[in-house]
């Protein structure tokens, strides 16, 4: 059974992941730029199911495409450095799901925009944090 300290660590990591995803979404929502329209044409794969930490495998597999889309947004008004940001998210995801996982991600048939993708993973983090609180 998970100890209280391991639960606390998991909760903190999930909170960090949640904040990072919220920061990206906020940056995109604040973005007044023709590039935004182009960003929204990129399609992301969504998990068929995302209810457990092992399902973060699905997020991990989409981090490279996410970085590529965020690279489009570089400007003086977009304050997220994609490489640092994705690297930070990747570290958190690996710690949360465990690097030895053999879980194979199953994706939904429908793809999503970056906004829908981020909202899905934000909801995932929030729901798991709620069960830990």
């Amino acid at each position: 059974a998970p100890t209280s300290s391991s639960t606390k660590k998991t909760q903190l990591q999930l909170e960090h992941l949640l904040l990072d995803l919220q920061m990206i979404l906020n940056g995109i929502n604040n973005y007044k730029n023709p590039k935004l329209t182009r960003m929204l044409t990129f399609k992301f794969y969504m998990p068929k199911k995302a209810t457990e930490l092992k399902h973060l495998q699905c997020l991990e597999e989409e981090l490279k495409p996410l970085e590529e889309v965020l690279n489009l947004a570089q400007s003086k008004n977009f304050h997220l450095r994609p490489r640092d940001l994705i690297s930070n998210i990747n570290v958190i995801v690996l710690e949360l799901k465990g690097s030895e996982t053999t879980f194979m991600c199953e994706y939904a048939d429908e793809t999503a925009t970056i906004v829908e993708f981020l909202n899905r993973w934000i909801t995932f983090c929030q729901s798991i944090i709620s069960t830990l609180t």
Epitope: H16, L25, H79, D84, L85, N88
Partner: antibody, heavy 113, light 107 residues
Framework: QVQLVQSGAEVKKPGASVKVSCKAS????????MHWVRQAPGQGLEWMGI????????SYALKFQGRVTMTRDTSTSTVYMELSSLRSEDTAVYYC??????WGQGTLVTVSS | DIQMTQSPSSLSASVGDRVTITCRAS??????LAWYQQKPGKAPKLLIY???SLDEGVPSRFSGSGSGTDFTLTISSLQPEDFATYYC?????????FGQGTKVEIK
């Protein structure tokens, strides 16, 4: 003990910039993301933005975008909030808060000609 | 942005009274709501997080409830040190937003 200590009060002229510091102690600096909140005299609380202290990236409220810059110095466990093109409406107490649980004492910034 | 509306904006009460403050979000925020107490010249102090969890060291006379869009902060028996301004705050989505505050004054 866990605490955030902010720099002292500032008086600035319209059009100038102000840089407020917030030094963390008593905990691992990179453990909690840092928010900045301001409060105009007799008014409510207003969120300005957030900084990830480990990686240094930021996200700002739309209202402040283009005027605010948040930075950090991990060697001194300090975060900074710089607000430029000051106007009288920016007169407020500026707070840093670590994970919403710990708050700095506040820094009064007065903008007056 | 999510708007947070508190009511009442001020209230007068006596020591020992039961006080209730409500907060309404413009859209569902699940239980991503916190309550703060602020005294003049001081920084806000976290009382309740996740809508109903009491922060460490906060007296048990404070309680929070609600989920979705409607939330309540209750002080079961008002003490002299409880006269202050109270704010609700949502952290469900950025930008983080606060209610306009409720000032609890001595009757």
């Amino acid at each position: 003990q866990v605490q955030l200590v902010q720099s002292g009060a500032e008086v600035k002229k319209p059009g100038a910039s102000v840089k407020v510091s917030c030094k963390a102690s008593g905990y691992t600096f990179t453990r909690y993301y840092m928010h900045w909140v301001r409060q105009a005299p007799g008014q409510g609380l207003e969120w300005m933005g957030i900084i990830n202290p480990r990686a240094g990236y930021t996200s700002y409220a739309l209202k402040f975008q283009g005027r605010v810059t948040m930075t950090r110095d991990t060697s001194t466990s300090t975060v900074y909030m710089e607000l430029s093109s000051l106007r009288s409406e920016d007169t407020a107490v500026y707070y840093c808060t670590s994970g919403w649980e710990v708050w700095g004492q506040g820094t009064l910034v007065t903008v007056s000609s | 942005d999510i708007q947070m509306t508190q009511s009442p904006s001020s209230l007068s009460a006596s020591v020992g009274d039961r006080v209730t403050i409500t907060c309404r979000a413009s859209q569902s925020i699940s239980t991503w709501l916190a309550w703060y107490q602020q005294k003049p010249g001081k920084a806000p102090k976290l009382l309740i997080y996740a809508a109903s969890s009491l922060d460490e060291g906060v007296p048990s006379r404070f309680s929070g409830s609600g989920s979705g869009t409607d939330f309540t902060l209750t002080i079961s028996s008002l003490q002299p040190e409880d006269f202050a301004t109270y704010y609700c705050q949502q952290s469900y989505s950025f930008p983080v937003t606060f209610g306009q505050g409720t000032k609890v004054e001595i009757k």
